[in-house]
C-alpha cells in the first residue's frame, strides 16, 4: 500500500535570467527511493538513479545542475521555462509517487523598466 506523500514547493516564480531550485520531498513512507525523474509533460530533464547517478538531458545540459539532494537547479531562465515540472519518485516496494511544481518566469524588473533610463 502506498502511504507516502510528496511535498513540493508548489507554485513558484522567478526572474528571467535567474535560477530556481526545484525541490520535492517524499515523506510518510519507509520505502526506498531508487530513482527520481524530473520531467515536463513532453520531455525529461534529468534522472537521479541510486546506482547510475545523475543523467541530464542534452537539451538542458548547459543550464541544469543536479541537486541540492534529489532536487534540480534550473539556471539562465527564460519565459519559455514557464510551466509545470514533475518530480517522479520511483520507490521500493511502494511504486511511483509524482509531485508537481508550477514555475512562472517573469520579465525582470530591469527589463521591464529599462526603457525609462
Amino acid at each position: 500500500m502506498m502511504t507516502g506523500t510528496i511535498e513540493t514547493t508548489g507554485n513558484i516564480s522567478a526572474e528571467k535570467g535567474g535560477s530556481i531550485i526545484l525541490q520535492c520531498h517524499l515523506s510518510s513512507t519507509t520505502a526506498q527511493v531508487t530513482q527520481v525523474n524530473w520531467e515536463q509533460q513532453d520531455q525529461l530533464l534529468a534522472i537521479c538513479n541510486a546506482d547510475l547517478g545523475w543523467h541530464i538531458s542534452p537539451s538542458f545540459k548547459d543550464r541544469v545542475a543536479p541537486g541540492p539532494g534529489l532536487g534540480l537547479t534550473l539556471q539562465s531562465l527564460t519565459v519559455n521555462d514557464t510551466g509545470e515540472y514533475f518530480c517522479i519518485y520511483h520507490t521500493y516496494p511502494d511504486g511511483t509517487y509524482t509531485g508537481r511544481i508550477f514555475l512562472e518566469v517573469l520579465e525582470s524588473s530591469v527589463a521591464e523598466h529599462g526603457a525609462r533610463f
Epitope: 520531467e39 513532453d42 520531455q43 525529461l44 534522472i47 538513479n49 543523467h55 538531458s57 537539451s59 511511483t96
Partner: antibody, heavy 118, light 107 residues
C-alpha cells in the same frame, strides 16, 4: 476504473479527413495526465501521433506534419483526433491511451480499425 | 527522433525457457524505456517502465534491465500465455517511438 473507448467511421475515402473520438470513463480528462492517440497499421508496429494534456495543450508527432489535430470536449469527457488528407498508408488500428508519469502508456482503448479506400 | 531497434523480429522458445528480448536506442535515453506485450486482436499492455520497474500486476517472471542505449526484457520461465509481440518504447521526449516489435512464438 479508468476506461477509454474509441469511436468513429471505419471507412474513410482518400484525401478526406479521418475523425475519431475517445470517450473516457472513470477519470476526468481535465484532472491530470496527457491523452494520446497511437496507431498501428495492419501487421506493423506502433506509432505515437500526439496528445492533449489535462490543461489543454497539444503536442504532435512531426512525422505527421500538419495533418493531425487533437482537441477535447470537456463537457463529454472526450478527446478527438482529426487526420487530414488521408491516403491508404493511414489505414490502421487507432488507439487512444493515457500517458502516465513517466511517459508510459498504462491505459488503452481497445482500438478501432480505420480503412482508407475509395 | 530517437530510433528504437529490436534486433529480432521473431524469437522461438519452449515452455520453461529463459527468454531475452533486446532493444537498442539510437541515443542515450538513460533509463527512460518501457516494454509492452501485445496479444493478437488486443491493445498493448504495459509490462515495464523506466527500464526496470514492473508495472502493477505484472508477473515477476518479467524483468527489465539496461540503461543508456541497450535494454533487455527477460522472461525467466516462459509460459504458454506469453506468446505475443513485445515492443520497447522510449519515454525520454516527444516524439515517443516504439521498436518494430519482437514476435515470441512457441517451439
Amino acid at each position: 476504473q479508468v476506461q477509454l473507448q474509441e469511436s468513429g467511421p471505419g471507412l474513410v475515402k482518400p484525401s478526406q479527413t479521418l475523425s475519431l473520438t475517445c470517450t473516457v470513463t472513470g477519470y476526468s480528462i481535465t484532472s491530470d495526465y496527457a491523452w494520446n492517440w497511437i496507431r498501428q497499421p495492419p501487421g506493423k508496429g506502433l506509432e505515437w501521433m500526439g496528445y492533449i494534456s489535462y490543461s489543454g495543450s497539444a503536442r504532435y508527432n512531426p512525422s505527421l506534419k500538419s495533418r493531425v489535430t487533437i482537441s477535447r470536449d470537456t463537457s463529454k469527457n472526450q478527446f478527438s483526433l482529426k487526420l487530414s488528407s488521408v491516403t491508404a498508408e493511414d489505414t490502421a488500428t487507432y488507439y487512444c491511451a493515457r500517458k502516465g508519469y513517466p511517459a508510459y502508456f498504462a491505459y488503452w482503448g481497445q482500438g478501432t480499425l480505420v480503412t482508407v479506400s475509395s | 527522433d530517437i530510433v528504437m531497434t529490436q534486433s529480432h523480429s521473431f524469437l522461438s522458445a519452449s515452455v520453461g525457457d529463459r527468454v531475452s528480448i533486446t532493444c537498442k536506442a539510437s541515443q542515450d535515453v538513460s533509463t527512460a524505456v518501457a516494454w509492452y506485450q501485445q496479444k493478437p486482436g488486443q491493445a498493448p499492455e504495459l509490462l515495464i517502465y523506466s527500464a526496470s520497474y514492473r508495472y502493477t500486476g505484472v508477473p515477476d517472471r518479467f524483468t527489465g534491465s539496461g540503461s543508456g542505449t541497450d535494454f533487455t526484457l527477460t522472461i525467466s520461465s516462459l509460459q504458454a500465455e506469453d506468446v505475443a509481440v513485445y515492443y520497447c518504447q522510449h519515454h525520454y521526449s516527444t516524439p515517443y517511438t516504439f521498436g518494430q516489435g519482437t514476435k515470441l512464438e512457441m517451439k
